[in-house]
Interface confidence: low
């Protein structure tokens, strides 16, 4: 004869938090370590699963195709229920009936998703939304890969993503002193550097590189380099290109300068020679397929020229230099140095020898050019 379950047989309710799409195991233990009859029911008393003889039977609940039990643990008195591919609506109070006692487990299923694509351009906003069961009042705390902490309720917003926000975000959802952790991979689409400066002597080949701060399985889009030469009144498009499956193909390129572009990533441009008329700054933009907005990288070119004309030795630089940079002319192995925080420096009647023109920032040499000054012999007066 089956004994009725009294109120005192009802054990204290446990709370278990689950993640949408994950698997959860709700435990139920009998006092005797042996195989015995058990049933799992939902709060509406609908049977989900149980034992019939030595077999697992399933009831008419909507969980039937996703619920299971570890048969191997039955003879140890463990009658857990495993629910696969959790849904928010699986949140409920589940009752395990075993040995004339009831164990109640409250399951709360949460989901955390990004409102938009998880591949976002630098400067765009990221919103994470928490899906939760009715009646719950969870709190969310997220930590970015760069160590930024953000707290919220059902939504968490990051107004302007930065490069360092790329990576795995760890979000902790708390409810009833219990926590569940979500990991969301965010890819911030940006160049590795916002800006770079290339320093070259006149005539040298110039290499511009634009490495990306992310990798995508399929990278498709189009780009352009606009250039504002220091000497020019307006900017002009130097090159336009397409990107398909990480492959670069040039669409249009100016005749002067005739830039060359590498076919593979990272984006790589070669200017055959650095000339004063090319010194200036450029903006490389990259528009990615199916993304609104563009990636930007600024690039600067500083060109140095050292010349000797009659009795004047001159060193000049063109391009965007900061006012704190020093330009110097220095005779090798001698103390003689002329320095200025300017874009040109000169020496009248320079001594013969190897002169060095140096562009430096707080003692660190950014660019140097050597020029040999040969002795000039006075012309003899004809009788």
């Amino acid at each position: 004869e089956q004994k009725l379950i009294s109120e005192e047989d009802l054990a204290a309710k446990k709370v278990v938090l689950g993640k949408k799409g994950d698997t959860v195991e709700l435990t139920c233990n009998a006092s005797q370590k042996k195989n015995t009859q058990f049933h799992w029911k939902n709060s509406n008393q609908i049977k989900i699963l149980g034992i019939q003889g030595l077999f697992l039977t399933k009831g008419p609940s909507k969980l039937s195709d996703r619920a299971d039990s570890r048969k191997s643990l039955w003879d140890q008195g463990c009658f857990s229920m495993i629910i696969k591919n959790l849904k928010i609506e699986d949140s409920d109070t589940y009752i395990c009936e075993v040995e004339n006692k009831k164990e109640e487990v409250e399951l709360l299923v949460f989901g955390l998703t990004a409102n938009s694509d998880t591949h976002l351009l630098e400067g765009q906003s990221l919103t994470l939304t928490l899906e939760s069961p009715p009646g719950s009042s969870p709190s969310v705390k997220c930590r970015s890969p760069g160590g930024k902490n953000i707290q919220g309720g059902r939504t968490i917003s990051v107004p302007q993503l930065e490069r360092q926000d790329s990576g795995t975000w760890t979000c902790t959802v708390s409810q009833d002193q219990k926590t569940v952790e979500f990991k969301i991979d965010i890819v911030v689409l940006a160049f590795q550097k916002a800006s770079s400066t290339v320093y070259k002597k006149e005539g040298e080949q110039v290499e511009f590189s634009f490495p990306l701060a992310f990798t995508l399985e399929k990278l498709t889009g189009s780009g352009e380099l606009w250039w504002q030469a220091e000497r020019a009144s307006s900017s002009k498009s130097w090159i336009t290109f397409d990107l398909k499956n990480k492959e670069v193909s040039v669409k249009r390129v100016t005749q002067d300068p005739k830039l060359q572009m590498g076919k593979k990533l990272p984006l790589h441009l070669t200017l055959p020679q650095a000339l004063p008329q090319y010194a200036g700054s450029g903006n490389l933009t990259l528009a990615l397929e199916a993304k609104t907005g563009k990636l930007h990288q600024e690039v600067n070119l500083v060109v140095m020229r050292a010349t000797q004309f009659q009795e004047n030795l001159t060193c000049e630089v063109w391009g965007p230099t900061s006012p704190k940079l020093t330009l110097s002319l220095k005779l090798e192995n001698k103390g003689a140095t002329v320095s200025k925080q300017a874009k040109a420096v000169w020496v009248l009647n320079p001594e013969a020898g190897m002169w060095q023109c140096l562009l430096s920032d707080s003692g660190q040499v950014l660019l140097e050019s050597n020029i040999k000054v040969v002795p000039t012999w006075p012309t003899p007066v004809q009788p």
């Epitope: 990798t215 399985e217 399929k218 499956n245 990480k246 492959e247 076919k263 593979k264 990533l265």
Partner: antibody, heavy 122, light 107 residues
Framework: QVQLVQSGAEVKKPGASVKVSCKVS????????MHWVRQAPGKGLEWMGI????????IYAEKFQGRVTVTEDTSTDTAYMELSSLRFDDTAVYYC???????????????WGKGTTVTVSS | ETTLTQSPAFMSATPGDKVNISCKAS??????VNWYQQKPGEAAIFIIQ???TLVPGIPPRFSGSGYGTDFTLTINNIESEDAAYYFC?????????FGQGTKLEIK
């Protein structure tokens, strides 16, 4: 001109693993993408995966995920494809193919190896 | 995953004939189709890139056409050395997929 020379035929038992090699000449391996493709008797070609040395990315076809491992030994310019937990239906000719010509997309398969026959038999 | 349906599976031709091999994609793949020729015991040879462009060194009797979902490899004025297995490949997206192949026999 890039050339690919593959290892010789192999006979394996079900459950075992096989490692097929592909030696590159005429170019350095670090500058080439390497695809792996197979063809079972009487069947069409099946793309298995690619190794992209530029970012070390490996992309596998879902069907082979977890069973195939693609590696490279840059010191010998040799690429390897290892397939584990072999089944009878893994009996096939396995090919390596690369984007070996600068004029084409990096992910093209413009140069192919002659193939390595792998037979799975008990 | 894009399925490429290649037809016919087998065909026979006489020297001087013109043949067409079809490759149909289950979704739009722009012009991202390459064609290859393979002879027994030999490595596959790249013959057509981006659906229509002949690979340098391949005889001009080979040509390709199509865009989107329907692609064709045409061989004009067939020669006995053209007897081989021909297959198409889509490289629009991963996983790359191949047509089932066409075996061309020369009588």
């Amino acid at each position: 001109q890039v050339q690919l020379v593959q290892s010789g035929a192999e006979v394996k038992k079900p459950g075992a693993s096989v490692k097929v090699s592909c030696k590159v000449s005429g170019h350095t391996l670090t500058e080439l993408s390497m695809h792996w493709v197979r063809q079972a008797p009487g069947k069409g070609l099946e793309w298995m995966g690619i190794f992209d040395p530029r970012d070390g990315q490996i992309i596998y076809a879902e069907k082979f995920q977890g069973r195939v491992t693609v590696t490279e030994d840059t010191s010998t310019d040799t690429a390897y494809m290892e397939l584990s937990s072999l089944r009878f239906d893994d009996t096939a000719v396995y090919y390596c193919a690369t984007g070996g010509n600068e004029d084409y997309y990096f992910y093209y398969m413009d140069v192919w190896g002659k193939g390595t026959t792998v037979t799975v038999s008990s | 995953e894009t399925t490429l349906t290649q037809s016919p599976a087998f065909m026979s031709a006489t020297p001087g004939d013109k043949v067409n091999i079809s490759c149909k994609a289950s979704q739009d793949i722009d012009d991202d189709v390459n064609w290859y020729q393979q002879k027994p015991g030999e490595a596959a040879i790249f013959i057509i890139q981006e659906a229509t462009t002949l690979v340098p060194g391949i005889p001009p009797r080979f040509s390709g056409s199509g865009y989107g979902t329907d692609f064709t490899l045409t061989i004009n004025n067939i020669e006995s050395e053209d007897a081989a297995y021909y297959f198409c490949l889509q490289h629009d997206h991963f996983p790359y997929t191949f047509g089932q192949g066409t075996k061309l026999e020369i009588k």
